[in-house]
């Protein structure tokens, strides 16, 4: 009599998560009498997947009616596949007895589960950095299978190359995760820039998933300060202007000091945005020269986004002749400057 064969025609089957998987198995003979059982894995630790006679297997159904006379098809369908179902499935013939004795196993069918990666999540630095500094962004995506995946970084439409990417775990697993870090050099123009992490995987059918981070969350553009003084008015009042330009974010406090004493403090709010996303702000101070005997040292002090204050100072000479008053005289643009206004 010819030896019984247990035939599993497919060496491997690949199924998308959520779909059903069909695992085929036929036998070459009806004898000897005895049941067929399905297992995942081999050896003593194998897991029973389906046994027609007993047990409750809600996700597993036979493809053909196993109670039908002369049935030789013992294929099964597993519904609602998840990555945890991945593994090698064996169709095993037993000889009827007390207990039943394992007679022959099929060659096994490896079930791999195609699972989509989660939407990439991009996180940036915890604290803001200024232009010319390098900041790191991290992109993470999880739960995908198979392991092969492509991740690209862009700053706007320029692909980034200073990138380090890891897929875990290194060995075989039911699903995988990817973590990538990109180093980005900031420029003063980056308030409106975006960093984009793009993940491409076989399950996405060509439509990559994207995660983005706005560089406006990562950048600080410190202000330029310029102090100018208009012509002396007839009523002996001097109008002094402090122009604060090209800063981001908007969080800014400006304090006027007269001879070291606080004259006025203002907070920037609801400023119009420049084309590049930065802000400008102008503050005026009227100084009554006739109320002062000595020269007046004026300081415009700006505290931007919690950073140490930046000062611009100059002196108004009250002892000089008012008629010779200069017009539109500017304090220099770097450091703490004093300028005598005549």
């Amino acid at each position: 009599e010819e030896e019984l064969q247990v035939i599993q025609p497919e060496k491997s089957v690949s199924v998308a998560a959520g779909d059903s998987a069909t695992l085929n198995c036929t036998v070459s003979s009806l004898i000897p009498v005895g049941p067929i059982q399905w297992f995942r894995g081999a050896g003593p630790g194998r897991e029973l997947i389906y046994n027609l006679k007993e047990g409750h297997f809600p996700r597993v159904t036979p493809v053909s009616d196993p109670t039908k006379r002369n049935n030789m098809d013992f294929s099964i369908r597993i519904s609602n596949i998840t990555p945890a179902d991945a593994g090698t499935y064996y169709c095993v013939k037993f000889r009827k007895g007390s207990p039943d004795v394992e007679l022959k196993s099929g060659a096994g069918t490896e079930l791999s589960v195609r699972a989509k990666p989660s939407a990439p999540v991009v996180s940036g630095p915890a604290v803001r950095a200024t232009a010319e500094h390098t900041v790191s962004f991290t992109c993470e995506s999880h739960g995908f299978s198979p392991r092969d995946i492509t991740l690209k970084w862009f700053k706007n439409g320029n692909e980034l190359s200073d990138v380090q990417t890891n897929v875990d775990p290194a060995g075989k697993s039911v699903s995988y995760s990817i973590r990538s870090t990109a180093r980005v050099v900031l420029t003063r123009r980056d308030v409106h820039s975006q960093v984009i992490c793009e993940v491409a995987h076989v399950t996405l059918q060509g439509d990559p998933l994207r995660g983005t981070a706005n560089l406006s969350e990562a950048i600080r553009v410190p202000p330029f300060l310029e102090v100018t003084q208009q012509s002396m008015r007839a009523d002996n009042q001097v109008n002094v202007t402090c122009q604060v330009t090209k800063f981001y974010p908007q969080r800014l406090q400006l304090t006027w000091l007269e001879n070291g004493n606080v004259s006025r403090t203002e907070m920037a709010s609801a400023l119009p945005e420049n084309k590049d996303g930065t802000y400008n702000w102008t503050s005026w101070l009227l100084v009554n020269v006739s109320a002062h005997r000595d020269d007046v040292k004026l300081t415009c002090q700006v505290e931007h986004d919690g950073q140490p204050a930046v000062n611009k100072s100059f002196s108004v000479k009250v002892s000089a002749h008012p008629k010779e008053q200069g017009s539109n005289t500017a304090a220099e643009n770097t450091g703490t400057n004093e300028r005598n206004i005549y």
């Epitope: 492509t150 439409g157 320029n158 692909e159 793009e198 491409a200 990559p208 994207r210």
Partner: antibody
């Protein structure tokens, strides 16, 4: 609308240098990489490399390392491609193409270079 | 580097005929980064299909793209005279980016 306009045809002798320009308009130049593609007469397309328009960092394919140079004048929204020590086999049409998240969505009209003694 | 081989190199089709152009890669290419370009004589290439199956702006619906891994194709459901051109596949999945040798499609 978005346009890439390349400089006109060039006729050069072997050993000379050529510099081809590609002027971009209709978008923020520094937000999209610029790629260069060679097409020899009657042949297919060959990707030569690209330049990061923000950092000006070039990337060259191995076949185009040495005599070839990508450069920028970002203030003029213009990318350049230079070949030194020209050889007969450099005879081709050279295209600039915008990169980004949808590679090659806009191309220049091409610059024909003829190298002949 | 990934070499893209297009077949056939030259083919002709009659108006109304279904046409399939293939692009075979020496190693796996992410479908997101497999593009097709159309080029007519004396003109620059035009982006035709991006990310394997998405038609670029203005491309007629009779065009379609499919594939994964190392095998990709561009199909024209019913050939029209305007479709006579050269078609190039392009991968930018991994460096160096490469083009296929092209298929020249002629009208009968």
């Amino acid at each position: 609308q978005i346009q890439l306009v390349q400089s006109g045809p060039e006729l050069k002798k072997p050993g000379e240098t050529v510099k081809i320009s590609c002027k971009a308009s209709g978008y923020t130049f520094t937000h999209y990489s610029m790629h260069w593609v060679k097409q020899a007469p009657g042949k297919g397309l060959k990707w030569m490399g690209w330049i990061n328009t923000e950092t000006a960092e070039p990337t060259y394919v191995d076949d185009f390392k040495g005599r070839f140079a990508f450069s920028l004048e970002a203030s003029a929204s213009t990318a350049f491609f230079q070949i030194n020590n020209l050889k007969n086999e450099d005879t081709a049409t050279y295209f600039c193409a915008r990169g980004g998240l949808r590679q090659g969505d806009y191309w220049g009209q091409g610059t024909t270079l003829t190298v002949s003694s | 580097q990934i070499v893209l081989t297009q077949s056939p190199p030259i083919m002709s089709a009659s108006p109304g005929e279904k046409v399939t152009l293939t692009c075979s890669a020496t190693s796996s290419v992410s479908a997101s980064y497999l593009y097709w370009f159309q080029q007519k004589p004396g003109s620059s290439p035009k982006l035709w299909i991006y990310s394997t199956s998405n038609l670029a702006s203005g491309v007629p619906a009779r065009f379609s793209g499919s594939g994964s891994g190392t095998s990709y194709s561009l199909t024209i459901s019913n050939m029209e005279p305007a479709d006579a051109a050269s078609y190039f596949c392009h991968q930018w999945s991994s460096y160096p980016y490469t083009f296929g040798g092209g298929t020249k499609l002629e009208i009968k």
